[in-house]
C-alpha cells in the first residue's frame, strides 16, 4: 500500500543555471494523499534557512503530483544561492533537499558562462 506521507521531490544537490533579467519558476514537487499541506520556500544563509515571506508563489496541480512554485520575475543577481521548500503535515515539518541557483549577469551570448563553467565556480554563491 502506498505511503500517505507528504513527499517533496527536489533532488539532492540539484542545480540550475539562470540569467539575471529572465523570468524563472523554481518548482517544489509535492506528493500528498488527502489535504494539501502548507508549503513554504526559504533561502539558505549559512546553516539557517530564511523563510521567503513576500515572494510570489503559486500552485500547479497535475494528476499525480502538485507543484509549489516560487516565481522570479525577473531573476536578480542576489537570487543566487540555495533554496529549500518545507511542508507542514500533521504537525510534522518535512524539508526538501536544497537546490542551488547560479545566476549569471546578462552579458552577450558569447560571454555567458556555460553550465559547466558555472558548476566549477561555487564561489559565486558567497
Amino acid at each position: 500500500k502506498e505511503s500517505c506521507d507528504v513527499q517533496l521531490y527536489i533532488k539532492r544537490q540539484s542545480e540550475h543555471s539562470i540569467l539575471a533579467g529572465d523570468p524563472f519558476e523554481l518548482e517544489c514537487p509535492v506528493k500528498y494523499c488527502a489535504n494539501r499541506p502548507h508549503v513554504t520556500w526559504c533561502k539558505l544563509n549559512g546553516t539557517t534557512c530564511v523563510k521567503l515571506e513576500d515572494r510570489q508563489t503559486s500552485w500547479k496541480e497535475e494528476k499525480n503530483i502538485s507543484f509549489f512554485i516560487l516565481h522570479f520575475e525577473p531573476v536578480l543577481p542576489n537570487d543566487n544561492g540555495s533554496y529549500r521548500c518545507s511542508a507542514n503535515f500533521q504537525s510534522n515539518l518535512i524539508e526538501s533537499h536544497s537546490t542551488t541557483l547560479y545566476v549569471t549577469d546578462v552579458k552577450s551570448a558569447s560571454e555567458r558562462p556555460s553550465k559547466d563553467e558555472m558548476a566549477s565556480r561555487p564561489w559565486l554563491l558567497y
Epitope: Y9, K11, R12, S14, E15, K115
Partner: antibody, heavy 119, light 112 residues
Framework: QVQLQESGPGLVKPSGTLSLTCAAS????????MYWVRQPPGKGLEWIGR????????RYNPSFKSRATISADKSKNQASLKLSSVTAADTAVYYC????????????WGQGTLVTVSS | DIVMTQSPDSLAVSLGERATINCKSS???????????LNWLQQKPGQSPKRLIY???KLDSGVPDRFSGSGSGTDFTLTISSVQAEDLAVYYC?????????FGQGTKLEIK
C-alpha cells in the same frame, strides 16, 4: 527493475573521440542522476562525471573537465559520454550508472563496455 | 578532492569467519543535511560493481544481512559476519558528499 545498456565502439584511434550511449529502462531518467565511471584493466574505479537529465546540468571530475561531455536525451531515456583527444591511457571499461536523485533508494550500474585506444 | 583510503588492500578469510574492511576519508563526509553519503560497492570477478550499502549502514534490497556498515565522519567499516564462497570480490568504498565523487583503491577479499 532498473536496467542500463551501454553501447558504442570498442576500439578508438589515438587523438580520436570515444562515444558511448547508455539506455535506461524501468525508470524515468528525469527522476535520477546518471553518471559515468571508468576502470582501467586491473585497476580501480574513477568517477568521470554526472548529469541531471531533468535540466542537463553536469558535474565533471576536473581530471576530465576539458575532454569529457555528458549529455542526456529524456525522450530516448538515455545518456551519452564523449571523451575527446584519447590516448592509450584512456583504455578502460566504461560504466554508466543511475541513482535515485531524491532518496538514493537505488543505484544501478550497467554491464560496462571495454574501450581500447589503439591505432 | 576527498581521498578515500581502504585497508587492507587484500585479505584472506576462511569460510564462516568474519571479514572487516576499513575506509578512511581525508575529510568529513557529513553533509549539510545531516546525512553521511558513504557507499560500499562489491565487484565480483568479471562483473560490474553493485552497491551493497549506502548512507553508511543502509543495506540495498537483496543484500544478505551478513553484510553491515558502520562509522561516521571520516572512519567507516564494512563487516561480513560470516564469509561465504560467493563473497569473493573486490570491495570499494566511495563518497557521495562532495564533487568530484571519489573511490577507495579497493580491497580484494579472498577465501582461505
Amino acid at each position: 527493475q532498473v536496467q542500463l545498456q551501454e553501447s558504442g565502439p570498442g576500439l578508438v584511434k589515438p587523438s580520436g573521440t570515444l562515444s558511448l550511449t547508455c539506455a535506461a529502462s524501468g525508470v524515468n531518467i528525469k527522476d535520477t542522476y546518471m553518471y559515468w565511471v571508468r576502470q582501467p584493466p586491473g585497476k580501480g574505479l574513477e568517477w568521470i562525471g554526472r548529469i541531471d537529465p531533468a535540466n542537463g546540468y553536469t558535474r565533471y571530475n576536473p581530471s576530465f573537465k576539458s575532454r569529457a561531455t555528458i549529455s542526456a536525451d529524456k525522450s530516448k531515456n538515455q545518456a551519452s559520454l564523449k571523451l575527446s583527444s584519447v590516448t592509450a591511457a584512456d583504455t578502460a571499461v566504461y560504466y554508466c550508472a543511475v541513482y535515485d536523485g531524491y532518496y538514493e533508494s537505488f543505484d544501478v550500474w550497467g554491464q560496462g563496455t571495454l574501450v581500447t585506444v589503439s591505432s | 578532492d576527498i581521498v578515500m583510503t581502504q585497508s587492507p588492500d587484500s585479505l584472506a578469510v576462511s569460510l564462516g569467519e568474519r571479514a572487516t574492511i576499513n575506509c578512511k576519508s581525508s575529510q568529513s563526509l557529513l553533509d549539510s543535511d545531516g546525512k553521511t553519503y558513504l557507499n560500499w560497492l562489491q565487484q565480483k570477478p568479471g562483473q560490474s560493481p553493485k552497491r551493497l550499502i549506502y548512507l553508511v549502514s543502509k543495506l540495498d534490497s537483496g543484500v544478505p544481512d551478513r553484510f553491515s556498515g558502520s562509522g561516521s565522519g571520516t572512519d567507516f567499516t564494512l563487516t561480513i559476519s560470516s564469509v561465504q564462497a560467493e563473497d569473493l570480490a573486490v570491495y570499494y568504498c566511495w563518497q557521495g558528499t562532495l564533487f568530484p565523487r571519489t573511490f577507495g583503491q579497493g580491497t580484494k577479499l579472498e577465501i582461505k
